[in-house]
Amino acid sequence: EQAPGTAPCSRGSSWSAALDKCMDCASCRARPHSDFCLGCAAAPPAPFRL
């Protein structure tokens, strides 16, 4: 986890201001509206899980 303004989150993760921590971009498949998903590299749309 990173503090904002310091080194970026590790590959495959992005900073969430709401949760105050780096979060996994992979979780954007299930929760695409999470704030940190804006910072994740665009990927082809995946099947959306229930």
Epitope: G12, A18, L19, D20, M23, D24, C25, A26, S27, R29, A30, R31, H33, A43, P44, A46, P47, R49, L50
Partner: antibody, heavy 119, light 111 residues
Framework: QVQLQQSGGGLVQPGGSMKLSCIAS????????MSWVRQSPEKGLEWVAE??????????HYAESVKGKFTISRDDSKSRFFLQMNNLRAEDTGIYYC??????????WGQGTDLTVSS | DIVMTQTPASLAVSLGQRATISCRAS??????????MHWYQQKPGQPPKLLIK???SLESGVPARFSGSGSGTDFTLNIHPVEEDDTATYYC?????????FGGGTKLEIK
């Protein structure tokens, strides 16, 4: 420090009811999805139920084996969630764990509580 | 439901050697970008502990002796070099869809 503290469990007769509780601390509870996972020698680790966050309309999902019998709920104001179990049968016997997930993996776990369904 | 098949059910590995545990899903649990497969370690009397998320991403605080690989339907957990403290049961779990399901577990013994 993240903690999930469980209560409830014990011995219940077949056809009886039991309510399990889990109180969370040390993380942003309201943003996380919460699940119950049970474990038995016969079935191993088995996901039971999930309740999502307010932003996901508190959607609930259940394993087929407990649909209509178990009800999951949460109280974000007190960082706690519950599993109401009705019409219990011997096959519901096991260790029940509460767990949190942002979306995919079970990150934090409670200590587990034993449920025995027997006459 | 997606069935997770773990092999072997148990294994004994000499201290300092490599332990390899396999998990096969009954259908693909991967996109072109990520695999929705996770690994846990469980010791007697304790809840499972997350080791690897998304097939290969090491959870914070987990020693680099643990590594995960695979995509699609076939995944592997490697532990090298194994230490005495690694005696435990290891489980895989997918999050591709509901219901989430776990493998049957692999009991690791250190010789």
């Amino acid at each position: 420090q993240v903690q999930l503290q469980q209560s409830g469990g014990g011995l219940v007769q077949p056809g009886g009811s039991m309510k399990l509780s889990c109180i969370a601390s040390g993380f942003t509870f309201s943003s996380y999805w919460m699940s119950w996972v049970r474990q038995s020698p016969e079935k191993g680790l088995e996901w039971v139920a999930e309740i999502r966050s307010k932003s996901d309309n508190y959607a609930t999902h259940y394993a087929e084996s407990v649909k209509g019998k178990f009800t999951i709920s949460r109280d974000d104001s007190k960082s706690r969630f519950f599993l109401q179990m009705n019409n219990l049968r011997a096959e519901d016997t096991g260790i029940y764990y509460c767990s949190s997930t942002y979306a995919d993996y079970f990150h934090y776990w409670g200590q587990g509580t034993d449920l025995t369904v027997s006459s | 439901d997606i069935v997770m098949t773990q092999t072997p059910a148990s294994l004994a590995v000499s201290l300092g050697q490599r332990a390899t545990i396999s998990c096969r899903a009954s259908q693909s649990v991967s996109t072109s970008t990520y695999s929705y497969m996770h690994w846990y370690q469980q010791k007697p009397g304790q809840p499972p502990k997350l080791l690897i998320k998304y097939a290969s991403s090491l959870e914070s605080g987990v020693p680099a002796r643990f590594s995960g690989s695979g995509s699609g339907t076939d995944f592997t957990l490697n532990i090298h070099p194994v230490e005495e403290d690694d005696t435990a049961t290891y489980y895989c779990q997918h999050s591709w869809e509901i219901p989430y399901t776990f493998g049957g577990g692999t009991k690791l013994e250190i010789k």
